[in-house]
């Protein structure tokens, strides 16, 4: 499919001008290559009329120009003094006319309306309001006032001052007679339809002395604004319909076959399933304007979109509307990244978020898409060191691997973490990506004690058991804080006995805290990584308490997972309590349960082989 994009249809009137914008991917080659505008012949060729290399055909001499805007990836063709002979099929393109890097444009030039003398022309947008003013003389002040519409050869009564209203105009028309001083009546028509266009006649009086005034009403269908966005990128539709519809329900719909327009999202809470997790409707300003953001653009998102206002929250005849034609460029600069990441309850995920590598200094954000209200994505973590309170100890945003990608790690997963998350920056707003976290059946791969109590001044050893599938990974311990997870020294204690059916490649890696201080209290993670790519993590909360009896602490899985408040008094161990205050998330569902059952290979955060767009918590 050609990545060139422009208007499919351009309509104008004899004597007028048109400006046609064509879009192209702004690669270095494309920016500098030849741009052209050519007319398609009956036998399939395309004859150049104007090009960026200076050629102008005799047909266009003195009335056309072509301007390239390489920084935007667009070029514009302006044609003036249009005649009906200019109607036809054209191409705007790059390179050689026959190469296929082009877009087909149909230009239709029509004859101007043949208007009677003294005709007032009213040009109004679809869905808006028109006021037709009708002057009259004093002798007709007390006589009947009326408005007719010319249908074929016959005038048809639309409204009159005796109270008649044509059924086609019911509920949207009124006739106002100005105060006695002004010899003027006016007809106001709301929610204009395309079918309202035509010739009208105002009349005051019914005899030969009546006053008459001709009016020509032109109802304009909004020309779609062309929008050119990259595959996997995002688009923002800004919809400003005016303060008169500030309190009316708003919608964005996508035109399907014929006149149908399927609601994508509206302010009444409707949202199309295809856009779940990747659309946000920003609330309206006081003037009624609003915007809709769609991210994770797909090929099938291309098409014509309308925004409008109607009490039903969908397109109806007479809705004021704005239109866009969205083209999704498949030659995208935005890299592929998994759209689905899977993890198990108690386990973890590592999400890779792409950003524009030119903006490495921008602030990175990760937020939770909220489906209940159309416009919210509350921040969970940023690259500046802010973490939402409920996520302390289990969420971290890392600038690694860098060079256009950052990593978000979320552990201690529960079913409540399933949902859609957005990666954002405060830089290029087109780089917003969505990832869905799914919680699947299985056990966490890494085994750590539930939570641990250390004693001031003593030594604490905390184990982390890694199954053999991670034999080739780097294993680490780190202390979590709101700016990341600071690496700590750890000891490889040899093969782990926590896994049945696992060979000598399983590993027990311990964290040792010597001479424990109050500052050692907090969250500790053990995890695996390959270079700058992070895999699974497991979290342990270490509480610190006063010395009660001498001895160092060596925490085992079984001992540390004793039931809350259970006394564990074997030699070398002290009481281990689940301290709800220090570990605010120890609900039964959320506690990362460590056990010694056989680890099925599908139990880790996994990659579905069926989808190149899915990533597991420990994949790259």
């Amino acid at each position: 499919k050609s990545p060139i994009f422009g208007p499919e249809e351009v309509n104008s009137v004899e004597g007028n001008s048109v400006s046609i914008t064509c879009y192209y991917p702004p690669t270095s080659v494309n920016r500098h290559t030849r741009k052209y505008w050519c007319r398609q012949g009956a036998r399939g060729g395309c004859i150049t009329l104007i090009s960026s290399e200076g050629y102008v055909s005799s047909k266009y001499a003195g009335r056309a120009n072509l301007t390239n805007f390489p920084e935007n990836g667009t070029f514009v063709v302006n044609i003036a003094q249009l005649s009906q002979d200019d109607s036809g099929r054209y191409k705007c393109g790059l390179g050689i006319n026959s190469r296929g890097l082009s877009f087909d444009v149909s230009l239709e030039v029509s004859q101007g309306p043949g208007l009677l003398n003294d005709t007032k022309v009213y040009t109004v947008d679809l869905g808006r309001t028109v006021t037709i003013n009708c002057p009259f003389k004093t002798e007709n002040a007390q006589k009947r006032k009326s408005l007719y519409k010319q249908i074929g050869l016959y005038p048809v009564l639309v409204i009159d001052s005796s109270g008649y209203v044509n059924p086609n105009y019911t509920g949207r028309i009124r006739l106002d007679i100005q105060g006695t001083g002004q010899l003027l009546f006016s007809v106001v028509i709301n929610q204009l339809r395309l079918s309202d266009a035509g010739q009208y006649l105002c009349q005051a009086g019914d005899d030969s002395n009546s006053n008459k005034k001709n009016a020509d009403l032109q109802v304009l269908k909004p020309e779609p604004e062309l929008v050119y966005e990259d595959l996997r990128g995002s688009v923002t539709f800004h919809c400003a319909l005016g303060p008169e519809v500030a309190n009316v329900a708003k919608f964005l719909c996508r035109q399907s076959s014929g006149e149908n327009c399927d609601v994508v999202v509206n302010t009444l809470g409707k949202r199309a399933p295809a856009f779940e997790g990747r659309i946000l409707l920003n609330p309206q300003d006081k003037d009624g304007s609003f915007s809709v953001v769609i991210t994770g653009l797909r090929k099938e998102d291309a098409g014509r979109y309308l925004c409008g206002a109607h009490s039903d929250g969908q397109l109806q005849e007479g809705s004021p509307i704005q239109a866009w034609q969205l083209f999704v460029n498949e030659e995208s600069t935005i890299p592929r990244s998994p759209t689905v990441v899977k993890g198990v309850a108690g386990g973890s995920v590592a999400v890779l978020c792409p950003y524009n590598r030119k903006e490495s200094k921008s602030i990175k954000y990760w937020c939770l898409w909220e489906g209940a209200q159309n416009g919210r994505c509350p921040l969970l973590v940023d690259s500046e060191g802010w973490v939402k309170a409920q996520y302390e100890g289990r969420l971290s945003l890392l600038e690694e691997p860098g060079n256009g990608t950052f990593t978000v790690i979320l552990n201690q997963l529960t079913s409540r973490d399933a949902g859609f998350y957005w990666c954002l920056t405060n830089g290029d707003t087109l780089w917003r990506t969505t990832v869905e976290i799914k919680i699947i059946e299985g056990e966490p791969n890494l085994k750590v004690p539930g939570n641990v109590t250390a004693v001031l001044g003593e030594t604490l050893k905390v184990p982390c058991h890694f199954p053999c599938k991670f034999s080739s990974y780097e294993k680490y311990w780190c202390k979590w804080n709101n700016t990341g997870c600071q690496a700590l020294p750890s000891q490889d204690e040899g093969p782990s006995k926590a896994f049945v059916n696992c060979d000598e490649n399983s590993r027990l890696v311990s964290l040792t805290l010597n001479l424990v201080t109050r500052a050692d209290e907090g969250w500790y993670w053990c995890g695996v990584k390959q270079g700058h790519f992070y895999g699974e993590t497991a979290a342990v909360y270490v509480a610190v308490e006063e010395r009660k009896a001498a001895g160092s602490r060596d925490v085992s899985l079984a001992k540390a997972d004793a039931a809350p408040d259970e006394k564990v008094l074997d030699s070398g161990f002290r009481e281990i309590e689940n301290k709800a205050i220090q570990d605010p998330r120890l609900f039964a569902e959320e506690k990362a349960v460590a056990d010694t059952r056989d680890q099925a290979d599908g139990s880790r955060a996994s990659v579905d082989s069926g989808s190149s767009e899915e990533q597991g918590g420990s994949s790259r």
Partner: nanobody, 131 residues
Framework: EVQLVESGGGLVQAGGSLRLSCAAS????????MGWFRQAPGQEREFVAA????????YYADSVKGRFTISRDNAKNTVYLQMNSLEPGDTANYYC????????????????????????WGQGTQVTVSS
């Protein structure tokens, strides 16, 4: 809701120093940025300094750079403004402000210097610098 109470204002000679404090209470876990703004009689309220509540990144108006320092104590939910080399032009009512974490997409584009981004405001404390 977050409540903010400023203190530390007063009368000081040009060239002198003052330290303003702003204590936050209520739902302080929702705070994202805290900032100081000032308003002189007949003037619009203007940005002075701001601090990111998580990592502590700071932002300053050009007019106070090198003279004023903003800092925070998360444990005490307090933000400070240390004002040195004070000038008569610094005379104003100083207001402390707090901003909630972003929720709407437009929030992510807002800058700490923008007055409209702040959700909560203190009553203000008067600083008068005499020449």
């Amino acid at each position: 809701e977050v409540q903010l109470v400023e203190s530390g204002g007063g009368l000081v000679q040009a060239g002198g120093s003052l330290r303003l404090s702003c204590a936050a209470s209520g739902r302080t876990s929702s705070i994202y940025n805290m900032g100081w703004f000032r308003q002189a009689p007949g003037q619009e309220r203007e940005f002075v300094a701001a601090i990111h509540w998580g990592g502590g990144r700071t932002y300053y108006a050009d007019s106070v750079k090198g003279r004023f320092t903003i800092s925070r104590d998360n444990a005490k939910n307090t933000v400070y403004l240390q004002m040195n080399s004070l000038e008569p032009g610094d005379t104003a009512n100083y207001y402390c402000a707090a901003r909630r974490a972003p929720e709407l997409l437009d929030d992510y584009k807002q800058k700490p210097e923008e007055i409209g981004t702040y959700h909560y405001w203190g009553q203000g404390t008067q600083v008068t610098v005499s020449s």
